[in-house]
Amino acid sequence: KETAFVEVVLFESSPSGDYTTYTTGLTGRFSRAGATLSAEGEIVQMHPLGLCNNNDEEDLYEYGWVGVVKLEQPELDPKPCLTVLGKAKRAVQRGATAVIFDVSENPEAIDQLNQGSEDPLKRPVVYVKGADAIKLMNIVNKQKVARARIQHRPPRQPTEYFDM
């Protein structure tokens, strides 16, 4: 369970057309459900019910986004449509380059994600909790375009990784 170093860059545009970037760093863990490798993409927040269906006729969302999923307390979500691992798989099927789970309210999900899988996903599946999860929630609450970069070693300089 290696540390995942996540950098989130918020892009805030001004009326003149210029934009400012704000970088926030947080840490999570790579789970055994996925690969321990770097990934980068625009953040797309996945509703717990938004990963339930599997309609063949669906238009696939563009590839290369980072899915963020907040898990609820198990007792408040007694009949989820998919397991946590199933949700990760569905997100990757739909084009996610990585999935980040906020497990703050469902720490049992960590064990589910770390059960040795014979067929782990080829994309990273990261979990965050506590203060790091709060940071992430605050970012997606800001309603600005945001990109996440997940690395398995500490970032050197944020500007090194983002082509502005």
């Epitope: 953040i43 797309v44 996945m46 509703h47 019910l49 969302y61 986004w65 899915g67 408040l76 997100a91």
Partner: antibody, heavy 119, light 107 residues
Framework: QVQLKESGPGLVQPSQTLSLTCTVS????????VHWLRQPPGKGLEWLGV???????DYNSALKPRLRISRDTSKTQVFLTLNSLQTEDTGIYYC???WGYGYNPFDHWGQGVMVTVSS | DIQMTQSPSFLSASLGDNITITCHAS??????LAWYQQKSGNAPELLIY???SLQSGVPSRFSGGGSGTEYVLTISNLQPDDIATYYC?????????FGSGTKLETK
């Protein structure tokens, strides 16, 4: 500031197709899911369907064969198409948004568009 | 599908009264309940979510409570601006069912 605005024809003939547009501003499809609901005259609210942040959709099972929801992210618009219209499809059609970080209610609504199905 | 049964359908009250509207779910919905207010000719507006959390900007005379299958919306010190129809709604599962509504009128 957050806005959702429905537009479309006020009158549609039976058996025809209804096409509505919801134009949104002040929030991102990356974080919010857009739902369609309707309200027959003098009656309660009925959920029709949703387009999730990832672009996939879910529909009310009773309407699924006739209903399609899509979007154009560049224009920040969501579309509803309902075919084989019947007089019972008359009502006010609303688009509304739902935050995707866990379970959340509909926190902003459009003002609605009245649709009458009549010959 | 989970059914939401709301009562009463009509409620007549005097300004200054405290009133209660109830919502019964056909199965345990774990508190994932919202209350909306709809004034004549307008779209619904969110009042309460997660059974008892007050939406930002909503006056504190509105409150929600309950758990399991039984939920209530209480309006304290009824004001003229509160005359509307109120709906409960579950939002943790399809098809996001609403109650049939309670139309509140003044005596």
């Amino acid at each position: 500031q957050v806005q959702l605005k429905e537009s479309g024809p006020g009158l549609v003939q039976p058996s025809q197709t209804l096409s509505l547009t919801c134009t949104v501003s002040g929030f991102s499809f990356n974080y919010y899911n857009v739902h369609w609901l309707r309200q027959p005259p003098g009656k309660g609210l009925e959920w029709l369907g949703v387009i999730w942040s990832g672009g996939n959709r879910d529909y009310n099972s009773a309407l699924k064969p006739r209903l399609r929801i899509s979007r154009d992210t560049s224009k920040t618009q969501v579309f509803l198409t309902l075919n084989s219209l019947q007089t019972e499809d008359t009502g006010i059609y609303y688009c509304t948004r739902m935050w995707g970080y866990g379970y959340n209610p509909f926190d902003h609504w459009g003002q609605g568009v009245m649709v009458t199905v009549s010959s | 599908d989970i059914q939401m049964t709301q009562s009463p359908s009509f409620l007549s009250a005097s300004l200054g009264d405290n009133i209660t509207i109830t919502c019964h779910a056909s199965q345990d919905i774990k508190g994932w309940l919202a209350w909306y207010q709809q004034k004549s000719g307008n779209a619904p507006e969110l009042l309460i979510y997660k059974a008892s959390s007050l939406q930002s900007g909503v006056p504190s005379r509105f409150s929600g409570g309950g758990s399991g299958t039984e939920y209530v919306l209480t309006i304290s010190n009824l004001q003229p601006d509160d005359i509307a129809t109120y709906y409960c709604q579950l939002y943790h599962s399809f098809p996001f069912t609403f109650g049939s509504g309670t139309k509140l009128e003044t005596k």
